[in-house]
Amino acid sequence: VPRLVLSDLHLLTQSQVRVSWSPAEDHNAPIEKYDIEFEDKEMAPEKWYSLGKVPGNQTSTTLKLSPYVHYTFRVTAINKYGPGEPSPVSETVVTPEAAPEKNPVDVKGEGNETTNMVITWKPLRWMDWNAPQVQYRVQWRPQGTRGPWQEQIVSDPFLVVSNTSTFVPYEIKVQAVNSQGKGPEPQVTIGYSGEDYPQAIPELEGIEILNSSAVLVKWRPVDLAQVKGHLRGYNVTYWREGSQRKHSKRHIHKDHVVVPANTTSVILSGLRPYSSYHLEVQAFNGRGSGPASEFTFSTPEGVPGHPEALHLECQSNTSLLLRWQPPLSHNGVLTGYVLSYHPLDEGGKGQLSFNLRDPELRTHNLTDLSPHLRYRFQLQATTKEGPGEAIVREGGTMALSGISDFGNISATAGENYSVVSWVPKEGQCNFRFHILFKALGEEKGGASLSPQYVSYNQSSYTQWDLQPDTDYEIHLFKERMFRHQMAVKTNGTGRVRLPPAGFATE
């Protein structure tokens, strides 16, 4: 720890002091530098400020002091391991007061109302006051008048000048003042009184359609005299006609783009094709936006979205009925569909394509398919701009013909009936099969009802004339081949109940 004693402090002048200290122990790592710090117990107690660093082979230095500071010094030795313990503090040296040597910086003038100007600045740090207190001499006059300056001395770091005209430029000076005098002659800053809303209406030059979902909007620069403030930029607002939200008739979703003041065009993208848009362009300043120039434009047609819900329905082992819904997003006037398909095992070769030139079409029958192949079907809706995104389905008649495994088949019973129901697989070829109910139990003697002919796509079958409280086996046959078996028991005797609504009976 370097020793620093009172006798080592020599006040050379009112603004210079010589500080000396004895070398610190280096602990086998040479001292690289000494840091001389000061504290002002009156203005910033327990806050130490560095006055400078000197090489490690020096044991004294001369320091420049500021007026009216209560200096208490200390010295810290620094080696490669870092700073050591600081020295004991010196006694306090108070420098005499003096006029300010600096003026405030960051002087600004701008209105927060239409008829005022608020002058602000960054206040001096206490170490630049040069006296117990500092004030500020604020001067202002309209720019270019060469007339007398108006002035006011204030303690706060701002001054509100009232009753100004709207957005007038002012010359502004702010000078530090204390009991010993004034600071140096300040620089002139240009400020402005309060802004008003712009009166300028941007004049649209035109709208260039870039594609079905983007436009370029251009306008002429506004007359700055009508901006009534600093032109900050342009607000571009646009919305689609008829874009009211479902749940709020009054609310229209509007999109906004802010364009910098030096730019007079903007590309609006992400628009919906084949739609009418409203557009507004407003100049804005610090106060707000001015009147809007209004315009309407329409985006051209684009390609449509993909058709909805493409289903394959087996007609025979060589034909399929394709059934679909139109796209949700037309993006224009639908003109029809394009259907393409190819066998899956031929790697995209042998692609066939049909133009379906009727936008009202919802079905198309494909014939001459191979019963042994699976196909990839691709359906696109078209507008005059061409085909859109495809909906794709894979299938064929082979997997869909023959009897299904009757997934999700179930049977329920009342007292004298039973309902057999199943979920037909999508695209499954319709076929006919037999359902046979066979009563079980000794006294029933295994009596069978006559087999009934049922269509697969009817989803359910109701068998009447069953005995109450009886176990039945249900047999499903196709072309004399046993396909499925299940069991059901009718309810005990009592009032006959009808089957649930919606079930087909035969």
């Epitope: 003109t335 029809g336 066939l352 394509s353 133009n355 030139r357 009727d358 936008p359 005059k384």
Partner: antibody, heavy 120, light 106 residues
Framework: EVQLVQSGAEVKKPGASVKVSCKAS????????MHWVRQAPGQGLEWMGD????????SYNEKFKDRVTMTTDTSTSTAYMELRSLRSDDTAVYYC?????????????WGQGTTVTVSS | DIQMTQSPSSLSASVGDRVTITCSAS?????MFWYQQKPGKAPKPLIY???NLASGVPSRFSGSGSGTDFTLTISSLQPEDFATYYC?????????FGGGTKVEIK
């Protein structure tokens, strides 16, 4: 420049066949469906059928389906229309016409026409 | 097949006249197509999908209509417009053409 150039005029006897060619240039031949339309003297236009040069798929007007065959040769970008069992009322100008961009469905480019005269 | 009936079958008009040709389909169609044909020449497309101008067609031509009734309008007849005009539908195969409307010089 997109062009369809057809073969020259033909004079045929009743019962004979005629094969009219249509050579395409200035575009990708396989990307557009080719149609055949005929026009009897002083009459209107009548669609005969079309062919997709990409895979040779055809669609014929029921009126002609037993007598007409449409083919293409992609190596020469040429479409052909053959009409068999000619009758005197087959005397007409036969046009090939390209179907425009998908979704527009109109005949955007036509050949100059081939006059076929059927006379004994 | 859908039958197309054009009217009038012929008309006489002067340069500068507004000319309207109508086409009626025997059943509802989605779109109408219009072609212009001059003597000894192949037809030339004018209007597709009811109201869209084919490439290079002057803006004095316009098309409108829906369902079974469609119209071709020439706002100001020019000397080069004297020709025969055909409508065509394509709801389903076969596409069928109207009998034509001959526009002659008065």
């Amino acid at each position: 420049e997109v062009q369809l150039v057809q073969s020259g005029a033909e004079v045929k006897k009743p019962g004979a066949s005629v094969k009219v060619s249509c050579k395409a240039s200035g575009y990708t031949f396989t990307s557009y469906t080719m149609h055949w339309v005929r026009q009897a003297p002083g009459q209107g236009l009548e669609w005969m059928g079309d062919i997709n040069p990409n895979y040779g798929g055809t669609s014929y007007n029921e009126k002609f389906k037993d007598r007409v065959t449409m083919t293409t040769d992609t190596s020469t970008s040429t479409a052909y229309m053959e009409l068999r069992s000619l009758r005197s009322d087959d005397t007409a100008v036969y046009y090939c016409a390209r179907e425009g961009a998908t979704g527009t469905w109109y005949f955007d480019v036509w050949g100059q026409g081939t006059t076929v005269t059927v006379s004994s | 097949d859908i039958q197309m009936t054009q009217s009038p079958s012929s008309l006489s008009a002067s340069v500068g006249d507004r000319v309207t040709i109508t086409c009626s389909a025997s059943s509802s169609v989605s779109f109408m197509f219009w072609y212009q044909q001059k003597p000894g020449k192949a037809p030339k497309p004018l209007i597709y999908l009811t109201s869209n101008l084919a490439s290079g067609v002057p803006s004095r031509f316009s098309g409108s209509g829906s369902g079974t009734d469609f119209t071709l309008t020439i706002s100001s007849l020019q000397p080069e417009d004297f020709a025969t005009y055909y409508c065509q539908q394509w709801r389903s195969n076969p596409p069928t053409f109207g009998g034509g409307t001959k526009v002659e010089i008065k």
